[in-house]
């Protein structure tokens, strides 16, 4: 992508596509970390083994992808969850059905300029599986305007249900458009 | 995307966005082809009718998208599955629940340099539908560093459950970022 | 992304990445609008509050994203649905089970050059939830060749089931690749 030009005058600085910040992170076994019951837990990621990489100043540190350059980024993640029979409200036995179990993924932005983390993307699903073991993915992806220094993380409702066995099932990435 | 330059000296070769390899393939009716029960079946695709296209040396041949240029590609697919009542383990009747039915999509990379196909992306979901006909999509998408000559295909757990009626329900694509 | 050049001769016009048309729209409360029972309802969107934006001549007007420049666009949307127990066929009580409830999202293109709207992407899922409240997202994303003036909208099977409470749960976007 270039501009038409008829003289070699100085051009605005654009990052060539090959030099654009980008990362694809893959799941690794999570170390259990204490956190409050209703608080979402942050996942940590593999950043340079197998299919995982960070490139062009995109940096991964302490569960965060750190944005090196302001611009519009496409951010995506898939989390595969798995569990056993869920305790969903059985309306045949109980008058007032229980709130069903659920699984939730949130891609969160933390900015130095703003004290409160911002939820960029949320995928949430009730899970009412009446038999045996269940497994299913939640996929998220969208474009956001980010600032240099913004940090991105992926939070989940229950870290113990995340399938961390395969890098192709649970992952997180971003690239400058 | 251009670099700042103050003299017309030779620049590194970058592929302008308009010339980047890209493809969007759509589902077509699959011909039943013999394959083993637990082996994932590869789908074949429409590459130039309706919404389907290949561009800028991206080539589709014999179920494979062939990568014409090394770089970072965003790869995506949606497979819509459909079936009838599934045989999921009923824990009320059986002490040891059956393994549930499941649907799986894998985007696979085959490289000349590596004998074993690599699973880039997997979406897998247990299906426990206790009544009537069911249908649901699995969506996948992520970025990968690919080499010239790498070949991509989409495999599914049961080709007979894929909805191949509509090009907007089941598709596969990739583009150089 | 630039072409190799050794002289400052006129180049083809390419849109630099920073100047490419792009938009990320987020859900807002929908005003009930009469529409036929089996007709899909179009959603309207927030285009400049919170995380929502339109950029570089991409325009949002009257439920439509209007494409300002021909090219290949990545288009995506997530719709989060929520509801109460669905009326799916109960095979234990009734011999002939009812068709299950379903949720559907369609990203539709309207072109001046073609009278009939085209379904670019469809995500459709049967919903057979036997207990209490349910919620789940449908995600779609793919690349399409669009023409200047094409209009994109998102249609859903039942507007009353769309979760319009959070901008991170239900959204729609597109960018020129």
């Amino acid at each position: 992508v270039t501009e038409e030009r008829s003289a070699p005058s100085a051009q605005p600085v654009y990052t060539p596509s090959r030099d654009k910040p980008k990362a694809h992170l893959t799941i690794m076994r999570q170390t259990p970390v204490p956190h409050l019951k209703n608080e979402l837990a942050a996942l940590h990621w593999e950043n340079n083994l197998g299919m995982a990489f960070t490139k062009n100043r995109m940096n991964y540190t302490n569960k965060f992808l750190v944005i090196p350059e302001s611009g519009d980024y496409f951010i995506y993640s898939q989390i595969t969850f798995r569990g056993t029979t869920s305790e969903c409200g059985d309306i045949s036995r109980v008058r007032r059905p229980k709130k069903p179990d659920s699984i939730t993924v949130v891609i969160t932005k933390v900015a130095d300029s703003y004290p409160e983390p911002a939820h960029l993307l949320t995928g949430t699903k009730s899970v009412c599986e009446i038999s045996s073991n269940w497994f299913q993915p939640i996929y998220l992806g969208a474009m956001f305007s980010l600032e240099e220094g913004d940090r991105l993380m992926v939070n989940v409702s229950d870290i113990s249900l995340v399938d961390y066995t395969k890098e192709d099932k649970t992952f997180f990435g971003a690239f400058l458009i | 995307v251009t670099e700042e330059r103050s003299a017309p000296s030779a620049q590194p070769v970058y592929t302008p966005s308009r010339d980047k390899p890209k493809a969007h393939l759509t589902i077509m009716r699959q011909t039943p082809v013999p394959h083993l029960k637990n082996e994932l079946a590869a789908l074949h695709w429409e590459n130039n009718l309706g919404m389907a296209f290949t561009k800028n040396r991206m080539n589709y041949t014999n179920k494979f998208l062939v990568i014409p240029e090394s770089g970072d590609y965003f790869i995506y697919s949606q497979i819509t599955f459909r079936g009838t009542t599934s045989e999921c383990g009923d824990i009320s009747r059986v002490r040891r629940p059956k393994k549930p039915d499941s649907i799986t999509v894998v985007i696979t990379k085959v490289a000349d340099s590596y004998p074993e196909p690599a699973h880039l992306l997997t979406g897998t979901k247990s299906v426990c539908e206790i009544s009537s006909n069911w249908f649901q999509p699995i969506y996948l998408g992520a970025m990968f560093s690919l080499e010239e000559g790498d070949r991509l295909m989409v495999n599914v757990s049961d080709i007979s459950l894929v909805d191949y009626t509509k090009e907007d329900k089941t598709f596969f694509g990739a583009f150089l970022i | 992304v630039t072409e190799e050049r050794s002289a400052p001769s006129a180049q083809p016009v390419y849109t630099p990445s920073r100047d490419k048309p792009k938009a990320h729209l987020t859900i807002m409360r929908q005003t009930p609008v009469p529409h036929l029972k089996n007709e899909l309802a179009a959603l309207h969107w927030e285009n400049n509050l919170g995380m929502a934006f339109t950029k570089n001549r991409m325009n949002y007007t009257n439920k439509f994203l209007v494409i300002p420049e021909s090219g290949d666009y990545f288009i995506y949307s997530q719709i989060t649905f929520r509801g109460t127990t669905s009326e799916c066929g109960d095979i234990s009580r009734v011999r002939r089970p009812k068709k299950p409830d379903s949720i559907t999202v369609v990203i539709t293109k309207v072109a001046d050059s073609y009278p009939e709207p085209a379904h670019l992407l469809t995500g459709t899922k049967s919903v057979c939830e036997i207990s209490s409240n349910w919620f789940q997202p449908i995600y779609l994303g793919a690349m399409f060749s669009l023409e200047e003036g094409d209009r994109l909208m998102v249609n859903v099977s039942d507007i009353s089931l769309v979760d319009y409470t959070k901008e991170d749960k239900t959204f729609f976007g597109a960018f020129l690749i």
Partner: antibody, heavy 117, light 108 residues
């Protein structure tokens, strides 16, 4: 609830062309493929071929040279034509919905076609 | 093409008994892509089982399909009066789709 209603001539002479039509109601025609299957005392059940909403067809190789499955201009109903019939083509002809894939979960009422001089 | 042979040709049983129907393929049916149908005289066939063991919508659980490769079985655990009919198998593991010759289950 899907319903398939079929009609066409039931008595033909050898070398004539069999022509049958099937109308679908209760579901979206474009959501499925639609097939023709026949059943004769001699050969049992035999898949003839199928079609989708875009007019894409698949045929049994043993009949391919004589068969055409096509759509009405409105897309539904769909039709079967079998040329140069002989006594061996005497059978009950059914239209059916192909669902999930390559199996047939809803059938028309069937039409007995007799080929006799 | 794959040829399907069904046995026995006729099965004479009483209500409440167990029926076991066999379908043998001339070559391996890939991915267990085999279906079973039930047909009453003068009516169209009705889909019972696909994928060798998946029950179609609305089919009672006394019908069970099993098998893989070249040997497949349809079992009716306890025959009901309405189960006396002709049963056909169909393979869809390779083109063209083919059907077996049928097994008649009759009331003894």
């Amino acid at each position: 609830q899907v319903q398939l209603h079929q009609w066409g001539a039931g008595l033909l002479k050898p070398s004539e062309t069999l022509s049958l039509t099937c109308a679908v109601s209760g579901v979206s025609f474009s959501d499925y493929h639609w097939a023709w299957i026949r059943q004769s005392p001699g050969k049992g059940l035999e898949w003839i071929g199928d079609i989708n909403h875009r007019g894409r067809t698949n045929y049994n190789p043993s009949l391919k040279s004589r068969v055409t499955i096509s759509l009405d201009t409105s897309g539904n109903p769909f039709s079967l034509k079998l040329t140069s019939v002989t006594a061996a083509d005497t059978a009950v002809y059914y239209c059916a919905r192909d669902f999930p894939n390559w199996v047939f979960d809803s059938w028309g009422q069937g039409i007995l076609v007799t080929v006799s001089s | 093409e794959i040829v399907l042979s069904q046995s026995p040709g006729t099965l004479s049983l009483s209500p409440g008994e167990r029926a076991t129907l066999s379908c043998r393929a001339s070559q391996s049916v890939s991915s267990s892509f085999l279906a079973w149908y039930q047909q009453y005289p003068g009516q169209a066939p009705r889909l019972l089982i696909y994928g060798a063991s998946r029950r179609a919508t609305g089919i009672p659980d006394r019908f069970r399909g099993s098998g893989s490769g070249t040997d497949f079985t349809l079992t009716i655990s306890r025959l009901e009066p309405e189960d006396f009919a002709v049963y056909y198998c169909q393979q869809y593991g390779s083109s063209p789709l083919t059907f077996g010759g049928g097994t008649k289950v009759e009331n003894k």
